[in-house]
Interface confidence: low
Amino acid sequence: NIDVCKLGTVTVQPAPVIPLGSAANISCSLNPKQGCSHYPSSNELILLKFVNDVLVENLHGKKVHDHTGHSSTFQVTNLSLGMTLFVCKLNCSNSQKKPPVPVCGVEISVGVAPEPPQNISCVQEGENGTVACSWNSGKVTYLKTNYTLQLSGPNNLTCQKQCFSDNRQNCNRLDLGINLSPDLAESRFIVRVTAINDLGNSSSLPHTFTFLDIVIPLPPWDIRINFLNASGSRGTLQWEDEGQVVLNQLRYQPLNSTSWNMVNATNAKGKYDLRDLRPFTEYEFQISSKLHLSGGSWSNWSESLRTRTPEEEPVGILDIWYMKQDIDYDRQQISLFWKSLNPSEARGKILHYQVTLQEVTKKTTLQNTTRHTSWTRVIPRTGAWTASVSAANSKGASAPTHINIVDLCGTGLLAPHQVSAKSENMDNILVTWQPPKKADSAVREYIVEWRALQPGSITKFPPHWLRIPPDNMSALISENIKPYICYEIRVHALSESQGGCSSIRGDSKHKAPVSGPHITAITEKKERLFISWTHIPFPEQRGCILHYRIYWKERDSTAQPELCEIQYRRSQNSHPISSLQPRVTYVLWMTAVTAAGESPQGNEREFCPQGKAN
């Protein structure tokens, strides 16, 4: 970087700014009485080329003119776009030890003339805003380029503003700082952009517009909503707008929704009634404005108003189910369960449930309120009982839902037939069945109920259930279904006053069990051996166990073992075998089988039968 040109000057012809592809001549001249002392003839002027402050070339071979010891002219060609620095240095050839001394320097800029600006677009934000225009400048010029935006209009209105582009900033937008008022609505305005740099100038085509073409109203502000008589479905949306607005667009949606409800409102004057809102729902409201029915532009959307509509009393029917358990000869425990209403039915925060148990003939009534979704009571085993549940929020209660308490599996003739459970994928099971063959009364509905077959599941966990219409014979169960867990699935057929059920086990995905059953004892009774075992721990079963296998072989024998396969029953933990020879020592073990395969063997036990075998 040359800062002080004490020793001489550097000039460039035709100019320090040249078009791409042009050549330039750089002349370096020493001032009088400057140069190598005593030996002017030993003055050697050299020219160095720098790009991005890096020396890239010594132009010694490009000399086209030389006044020995006084001045030299160099021709430079093939300069790349942008800025190139040339530094002239004095080399005193009689003193090789001293480095060349800087004389002066010049920066040559290579660029192109500006293209005519295109795609001019002007806007005025709001009635009190100012006109701002933007344009496309075209190709980069690599030079400082000045842009002038000129506007002309009625009554000799003229206005202009300037900005420039360079390697640090881009000029493609200018705010004229003038306001067009609505009284000029029909007037036409013309804007033009002129670009100029050291290599030329160009002008855009004139761009014509009217007030309505360019004025974008400010978005509405101060948005609020008033709910009529605290209604959850009707509200009046209010807002502030600029004075000239004639058309509004409203959009609103529940916060978790993906699609907007759209409304157009003409001459709304900052007010609009909405009648289709969902109670107790978080909504987002936005409004946009326009100054003219047919022309002009819409404003940006306003800031969102987010609010929750008020509550209304619950609607809909609770889904109720129950379990009956005899306690002793004259008492039974009834456990009622119900599913929460979905938000569109609850229409508010459910504060409590009203539960009623009523004996139909004797008019005995038990009533209570609970905040839970289950309720348990002990009642007499005699009589016909009915239960009802309703949900209450701050605005009221839903209509009670009734269910008759019947003996759910009491009528064999109502038991569904050919119940099957098939794995559909990792998290659901397809249950199918056939209707009861000889039902006394019509099936009103089916209930498919399921729970995990794990210790304590009946007391710890509420059941899961699905209500199925009487003409359907299948259900896809997915709620709380996990892979590698066996579920007990019951299909109940309910008539008005009776119930029948069938049971099956099923899983959504299975593997072979991790381990086999553990043989705990082998006992000999009446010429038969009884094998007793403990079941595989629940987490190691990995699905529904279909069979147990008992293997035995003579100790030290290399023959294949014999086996006995037993249908799995949860309640069974012993089994007799009767084909073993007396006074022969046997080794016995067990495995478990799921639909995916057989487990490794459990523990081995040795036993030598004493009695007479069959």
Epitope: I2, V4, V10, D53, M83, E107, K144, F164
Partner: nanobody, 119 residues
Framework: QVQLQESGGGLVQPGGPLRLSCAPS????????MAWFRQAPGKEREVVAT????????YYADSVKGRFTISRDNAKNTAFLQMNSLRPDDTAVYYC????????????WGQGTQVTVSS
């Protein structure tokens, strides 16, 4: 005609920072190349740092590289010299200078501001 006015000089302890400002008036600042020079007692005036009209190119004397930063704010019509890790040999009168283009000699000079580095 361009007038240059420096400010920000003063007494500072060794290792401390100082920020000089230069505000030109009289013509469009954004087309001027700017520089800071200094002159210590009994020594010649020397260039400290320069910056092109766009701010795209800067130059620093070897003695200040890594410690001093030259910058400009075309919107505020001001050039700055941020001086960090000052040393006693930085003591001098600091001058702001300007020229019409990014080459040639400096045409406009300020009156200077004294910077003294001493404990």
């Amino acid at each position: 005609q361009v007038q240059l006015q420096e400010s920000g000089g003063g007494l500072v302890q060794p290792g401390g920072p100082l920020r000089l400002s230069c505000a030109p008036s009289g013509r469009t600042f954004s087309t001027l190349a700017m520089a800071w020079f200094r002159q210590a007692p009994g020594k010649e005036r020397e260039v400290v740092a320069t910056i092109s009209w766009s701010g795209g190119r800067t130059y620093y004397a070897d003695s200040v590289k890594g410690r001093f930063t030259i910058s400009r704010d075309n919107a505020k019509n001001t050039a700055f010299l941020q001086m960090n890790s000052l040393r006693p040999d930085d003591t001098a009168v600091y001058y702001c200078a300007a020229r019409e283009s990014d080459y040639g000699s400096y045409d406009y000079w300020g009156q200077g501001t004294q910077v003294t580095v001493s404990s």
